[in-house]
Interface confidence: low
């Protein structure tokens, strides 16, 4: 039975040219996290494997930085980065948990950031 829940940064906004941290946190389960995939719509951005570390998709390598933790930092944001992002936690023995984040990249210099989720 899957008892875990994923907390995410939710809906967030950022300024064009800036950077943003995408973060998810898996709680309420003792399952072992074996791998976390970060995806934008159907496109793989990055993989963090518990044993092998990070693999950044080549087309995002210069704008995506691993971390903090299992999160992902997007840099040099463009309006085209607006959209849904998914953190997919592969766990044993529970299986797969998915979290959703919606990022809006604004042209305006008055981008209002929603409440930021911080992992202590």
């Amino acid at each position: 039975m899957m008892t875990g829940t994923i907390e995410t940064t939710g809906n967030i906004s950022a300024e064009k040219g800036g950077s943003i941290i995408l973060q998810c946190h898996l709680s309420s389960t003792t399952a072992q996290v074996t791998q976390v995939n970060w995806e934008q719509q159907d496109q793989l951005l990055a993989i963090c494997n518990a044993d092998l570390g990070w693999h950044i998709s080549p087309s995002f390598k210069d704008r995506v930085a691993p971390g903090p933790g299992l999160g992902l930092t997007l840099q040099s944001l463009t309006v085209n980065d607006t959209g849904e992002y998914f953190c997919i936690y592969h766990t044993y023995p529970d299986g797969t948990y998915t979290g959703r984040i919606f990022l809006e990249v604004l042209e305006s210099s008055v981008a209002e950031h929603g409440a930021r989720f911080q992992i202590p």
Epitope: C48, A50, L52, G53, W54, H55, P58, K61, A65, P66
Partner: antibody
Framework: EVKLVESGGGLVQPGGSLRLSCATS????????MSWVRQPPGKALEWLAL??????????EYSVSVKGRFTISRDNSQSILYLQMNTLRAEDSATYYC??????WGQGTLVTVSA | DIQMTQSSSYLSVSLGGRVTITCKAS??????LAWYQQKPGNAPRLLIS???SLETGIPSRFSGSGSGKDYTLSITSLQTEDVATYYC?????????FGSGTKLEIK
């Protein structure tokens, strides 16, 4: 721009020691796995050692050929990677490269082990 | 340890031709395979990661394919600047072993 610059190579006698350094810039050092790879003259690449990132506790892995003789370490405050090489043998003669996750490599430093 | 076997040490190809370099792993590596190009006196240059993903700035005449244990690097319309030694590397399981290299020459 990501930069990796190795130093510390040179001529050393068999049984001797050497410490290689890899100065890095252009990225957040603590977020990346770092490795050492070597290449004897005219031969193939050989993966030597890995040190993981902060998120993975800076744990290390070694190839059988250097385990117990070489030690990989990192100075996260200065963004420098090290390879401490002890009990060197003639077959350790090679160009030593440091590499960052994502395909970035330095230009290498030459180590020659000879009497 | 996973052994990586590049069956051809040398390949001779005509300019403008097509070449396929093969790499076989001793165990499944789940597409965690990289291809590097190395020219004399230079550090290796990453061409492909994840078995098929072309690195930024690498010409589209390079492509990677394969799965499980068997992988290939293909170069179409061979150019003089493609003369180099090509290495595969698995990064599924430490130690992250390399193949022995395939040296490409112009016929």
């Amino acid at each position: 721009e990501v930069k990796l610059v190795e130093s510390g190579g040179g001529l050393v006698q068999p049984g001797g020691s050497l410490r290689l350094s890899c100065a890095t810039s252009g990225f957040t050092f603590i977020d990346y796995y770092m490795s050492w790879v070597r290449q004897p003259p005219g031969k193939a690449l050989e993966w030597l050692a890995l040190i993981r990132n902060k998120a993975n506790g800076y744990t290390t892995e070694y190839s059988v050929s250097v385990k117990g003789r070489f030690t990989i370490s990192r100075d996260n405050s200065q963004s420098i990677l090290y390879l401490q090489m002890n009990t060197l043998r003639a077959e350790d003669s090679a160009t030593y490269y440091c590499a960052r996750d994502g395909g970035y490599w330095g230009q290498g430093t030459l180590v020659t082990v000879s009497a | 340890d996973i052994q990586m076997t590049q069956s051809s040490s040398y390949l001779s190809v005509s300019l403008g031709g097509r070449v396929t370099i093969t790499c076989k792993a001793s165990d499944h590596i789940n597409n965690w395979l990289a291809w590097y190009q190395q020219k004399p006196g230079n550090a290796p240059r990453l061409l492909i990661s994840g078995a098929t993903s072309l690195e930024t700035g690498i010409p589209s005449r390079f492509s990677g394919s394969g799965s499980g244990k068997d992988y290939t690097l293909s170069i179409t319309s061979l150019q003089t600047e493609d003369v180099a030694t090509y290495y595969c590397q698995q990064y599924w399981s430490t130690p992250f072993t390399f193949g022995s290299g395939t040296k490409l020459e112009i016929k």
